[in-house]
Interface confidence: low
Amino acid sequence: AWELTILHTNDVHSRLEQTSEDSSKCVNASRCMGGVARLFTKVQQIRRAEPNVLLLDAGDQYQGTIWFTVYKGAEVAHFMNALRYDAMALGNHEFDNGVEGLIEPLLKEAKFPILSANIKAKGPLASQISGLYLPYKVLPVGDEVVGIVGYTSKETPFLSNPGTNLVFEDEITALQPEVDKLKTLNVNKIIALGHSGFEMDKLIAQKVRGVDVVVGGHSNTFLYTGNPPSKEVPAGKYPFIVTSDDGRKVPVVQAYAFGKYLGYLKIEFDERGNVISSHGNPILLNSSIPEDPSIKADINKWRIKLDNYSTQELGKTIVYLDGSSQSCRFRECNMGNLICDAMINNNLRHTDEMFWNHVSMCILNGGGIRSPIDERNNGTITWENLAAVLPFGGTFDLVQLKGSTLKKAFEHSVHRYGQSTGEFLQVGGIHVVYDLSRKPGDRVVKLDVLCTKCRVPSYDPLKMDEVYKVILPNFLANGGDGFQMIKDELLRHDSGDQDINVVSTYISKMKVIYPAVEGRIKFSTGSH
């Protein structure tokens, strides 16, 4: 028997520095977790203690903090090289700055293979990107070889900016021939490493003949056997065992997100490459694990540029950006409108001639807007200003909801109106009218939404049975501020870009902004 230790991360989302327990900015070091310096300590400890170790990443290193905003992926290549990753799969967010934003900072600089079997380049891009990412890679480990095949969510064109010269194929269809090829090369230990979410990971384990282990990402799935060490609730045991169609037991793993845990899976293979046993658990990277001093010193060196960036002007406002709770928790506020407009703008994807865009709607809890911005400071808007408005380090995500769920959400928005509570919704691509004289749960008297399947966008009444795409904060997607109906009834959830980054990019693009209060939210006569 031959034993392999797989260490794995996924959805790190630019958390290079240690973070608080909820993966936001670290305030108190004795409570902070993760970060590449701490990760390196643990990885090195395991490399010293165990003979056959692979360190793998399942995608979405890009996007999530000011590190990515400033360094645009160069930081990912630099620190993943320093940690000596063995392989990485491409995630959807690796395309956030277009193909160029992937090729130059990461693909050309990485000293480890970057993989995806289901992304095919065409046209002029094919020769430019050739060899920079691979469908699979055979890695020598001790006296053996291990094959790694990569895969990426086929939804990436809707979630990021891969352009028109990359085709995202069905994962299972694309993986099978690559695995077959590895078998003909006498590689009998094969790991599928990819970024399509836990449901697809399980399908790959079930359907792709010859895959021994699946290491996934995208759905931020936390798996754990026994008592979980922090506040994440396990979606199942670690590893999650899937019985393949040809009768094999295939371990599937994921390690939550944000570098908070290091996935740790021990696999025992027989001489024919069959999995005899698999066990392990994610390791919580808490402050009992010291940060490696040399990586930490390097982080501090790279940090200097971030501090300078946060005070530079992104753009100007010529109007007061009203982010006060007195406005945003009671009525339409222009800060809410600005943020929602930025959220929609960030999700412009012309993927189908029938649609002007795949999504037109935004909702945003008023309680998530934490500060106004005064235009009388020469109109200057900085990252620092935006961090005061959106201090929680969240993301703006894409969900699919039925009209009936949206209606419930808007009823919840005003169910206890007048108490300055955070659930009052700011909107984009939506016109809502409330009648506060009616009883809670029956206060939405008009709800019109902007069409997507149209060449000239217009507002149509919400249809209860129709499925709509909506951009919203991850806080709401997870049921925050009492929006349990969103969490319980959503049909799909894809995590998006860092909230501040979305707004800062929009302001930089627009250069001068002047959002107005324009009648998106109205109260019917006599009640307000």
Partner: antibody
Framework: QVQMKQSGPELVKPGASVKIPCKAS????????MDWVKQSHGESLEWIGD????????IYNQKFKGKVTLTIDKSSSTAYMELRSLTSEDTAVYYC???????????WGQGTSVTVSS | DIQMTQSPSSMYASLGERVTITCKAS??????LSWFQQKPGKSPKTLIY???RLIDGVPSRFSGSGSGQDYSLTISSLEYEDMGIYYC?????????FGGGTKLELK
Amino acid sequence: QVQMKQSGPELVKPGASVKIPCKASGYTFTDCNMDWVKQSHGESLEWIGDINPNNGGTIYNQKFKGKVTLTIDKSSSTAYMELRSLTSEDTAVYYCARTNWDYAMDYWGQGTSVTVSS
Amino acid sequence: DIQMTQSPSSMYASLGERVTITCKASQDINSNLSWFQQKPGKSPKTLIYRANRLIDGVPSRFSGSGSGQDYSLTISSLEYEDMGIYYCLQYDVFPRTFGGGTKLELK
């Protein structure tokens, strides 16, 4: 006002176990972590560990791992520290201390004296 | 573990005198430092946290300062009830560690 109330002195035999309660009042129990500290006679203080009453998550000083188990009972707003396999080395006063938003200890229990003797 | 070296280990001072006790950490602790006062047979009482923030109800004659590895507690004008043992604690990394204590006695 914020108070941490601990039980009275314990005289226990070597090899036995003891479970010390620390009942919190005057604040929302789940808002603050609880730390435990050991003080042997005439000595300085030693940090034992910390428990988060929200999820029962614990962090222990390596030195006390296997010796100590920290638990909570949310319904009674009580934190507990169990000491196992007691020896004379465990003779000391044990304190619970609430930690504030900054994770700094702010309010202390009055201490429970544990004497291990046959 | 981080070592906390407190000095002096004991000292004598007169009423009304200005008293300073220092604490040195073996590495940078990012101002995550508390000071406690303990009287014989009593539990410790927290005076200061985050290096310089006074706990509610603690007299203003107590103050804390410092950053990085070096911290100090100052009593601007010593009063009789200030006699006791003073401890520092770092809570920047686990395990949290206390200084060895400074015994303050009346001259």
